[in-house]
């Protein structure tokens, strides 16, 4: 059977903007040379502010008549970018976002690129390759990921509040040790979600609590010492886990130390 392993390639462009390309060896379903050719759809999470490259099926230009990219974004008319090999012409219909372009000349590379991915790029992208014997399709459900900003503070006696602000999709917050917790979600018009978890610990031998925020862009753990006197200076310390230590919580200073990164948060 074909190998459907996912290949997510990450590089740096100008040492600043990460670029990712999701092009996997999709399963070919053209059995018995039926004219119902490969239709493959991929769900693809991509981080905001990166560059993204979307690929067509692996078919040589010599076999093609037309290459079309169909782009369906929320609240917008369907945009199509087409290349006709016979006349070597390209045509666009209803395409207004200048950040979505062919990677290069379509006769050299049929890939589509999105420069500096924004929340508005959430949507469905499909490459249609027209051959003399039928069409090959490659579709992407693009989900733009936004890293939430994480804060942790104590707001009253033995009660801590952990917030993951404006993430997409919503982050998940858990605590160690478990306390008496209430979690609320606030949805913003741009599609991001703020998650707020407030926990209380009645047991007095619990002196330090950890808030663990899980998100598709990476995980973050912050911890705080529960102080008995309200209004005293409190600190939240934390470290990343997993491959991506990318949460940059507001008012958190990053210090290099023997144990990795330590984050000090001062609540006034």
């Amino acid at each position: 059977q074909p190998n459907n392993s996912l290949m997510l390639q990450t590089s740096k462009e100008n040492h600043a903007l990460a670029s990712s390309s999701l092009c996997m060896d999709e399963k070919q379903i053209t059995q018995n040379y039926s004219k119902v050719l490969a239709e493959v759809n991929t769900s693809w999470p991509v981080k905001m502010a990166t560059n993204a490259v979307l690929c067509c099926p692996p078919i040589a230009l010599r076999n093609l008549i037309i290459i079309t990219w169909e782009i369906i974004l929320r609240g917008q008319p369907s945009c199509t970018k087409a290349y006709k090999k016979e006349t070597n012409e390209t045509k666009e219909t209803n395409c207004t976002d200048e950040r979505i372009t062919w990677v290069s000349r379509p006769d050299q590379n049929s890939d589509l690129q999105i420069r500096t991915v924004a929340i508005t790029h959430d949507g469905y992208y499909r490459c249609i390759m027209v051959t003399p014997d039928g069409n090959f399709h490659r579709g992407y459900h693009l989900q733009v990921l936004v890293t939430p900003e994480v804060t942790l503070f104590q707001n009253r006696n033995r009660t801590a509040v952990c917030k993951a602000v404006a993430g997409k999709p919503a982050a998940h917050i858990s605590w160690i040790p478990e306390g008496d917790c209430a979690t609320k979600q606030e949805y913003w018009s741009n599609g991001t979600v703020t998650v707020k978890s407030t926990c209380h610990w009645e047991v007095h031998n619990v002196s330090t609590v950890t808030c663990h925020v899980s998100h598709l862009t990476g995980n973050k753990s912050l911890y705080i010492e529960l102080l008995p006197v309200p209004g005293a200076k409190k600190s939240a310390k934390g470290g990343g886990s997993g491959l991506n230590d990318i949460f940059e919580a507001q008012k958190i200073e990053w210090h290099e130390g023997s144990g990795g990164h330590h984050h000090h948060h001062h609540h006034h």
């Epitope: 074909p2 092009c23 040379y33 690929c55 692996p58 078919i59 003399p132 014997d133």
Partner: antibody, heavy 119, light 110 residues
Framework: EVQLVQSGAEVKKPGASVKVSCKAS????????MFWVRQAPGQRLEWIGY????????KYNEKFKGRATLTSDKSASTAYMELSSLRSEDTAVYYC????????????WGQGTLVTVSS | DIQLTQSPSSLSASVGDRVTITCRAS??????????MHWYQQKPGKPPKLLIY???NLESGVPSRFSGSGSGTDFTLTISSLQPEDFATYYC????????FGGGTKVEIK
């Protein structure tokens, strides 16, 4: 069932020309690019060129430009490879192969035609 | 043009052996996430038979003891347990813009 049937073996003198045919069946002939490949005794497979019967586009390996001519007869679903100014080093088995769209791979090959160039 | 170098050019093995053949391209044959490298088996007097396409995809009807891997410039064909019918010559092949074959690896009985 897809089949590619090639013409029979040929013996030619140096300087002569040879024309090998490849009759396709079991699919729409004009829908797929046909490649021609040869294999001299004990040598690696060598690409000669391809023809796209859909639009008659052709492309040749630089080594064979000017000597090889690829044509097709759509009504007969047949591709042809003609090689001129034959020399002894052209002695080889010549294959036609249909390029499949996905991955540009060759699933279907002709049985091969042995062309011997000898004085 | 891209040159493909296969190694070894020949090898002797016994039934049941694990056999590995490598193919190195003079420049990357991977583009848009796909590696345009295929593997063929050829027996005397016969045309090549496709085994693996796009580096790692097993062609329909080919036994699962055959597998392919690699990307960029370095590729491998592996036969996990050599069978009597596997004694043949194996070729790697690249076909993105121009068609190129490796020099072949002849697998003989030890």
């Amino acid at each position: 069932e897809v089949q590619l049937v090639q013409s029979g073996a040929e013996v030619k003198k140096p300087g002569a020309s040879v024309k090998v045919s490849c009759k396709a069946s079991g699919y729409t002939f004009t829908s797929y690019v046909m490649f021609w490949v040869r294999q001299a005794p004990g040598q690696r497979l060598e690409w000669i060129g391809y023809i796209n019967p859909y639009n008659d586009d052709t492309k040749y390996n630089e080594k064979f430009k000017g000597r090889a001519t690829l044509t097709s007869d759509k009504s007969a679903s047949t591709a042809y490879m003609e090689l001129s100014s034959l020399r002894s080093e052209d002695t080889a088995v010549y294959y036609c192969a249909r390029e499949d769209y996905y991955g540009s791979r060759f699933v279907y090959w002709g049985q091969g035609t042995l062309v011997t160039v000898s004085s | 043009d891209i040159q493909l170098t296969q190694s070894p050019s020949s090898l002797s093995a016994s039934v049941g052996d694990r056999v590995t053949i490598t193919c190195r391209a003079s420049k990357s044959v991977s583009t848009s996430g796909y590696s345009y490298m295929h593997w063929y088996q050829q027996k005397p007097g016969k045309p090549p038979k496709l085994l693996i396409y796009l580096a790692s995809n097993l062609e329909s009807g080919v036994p699962s003891r055959f597998s392919g891997s690699g990307s960029g410039t370095d590729f491998t064909l592996t036969i996990s347990s050599l069978q009597p019918e596997d004694f043949a010559t194996y070729y790697c092949q690249h076909n993105r813009e121009l068609l190129t074959f490796g020099g072949g690896t002849k697998v003989e009985i030890k």
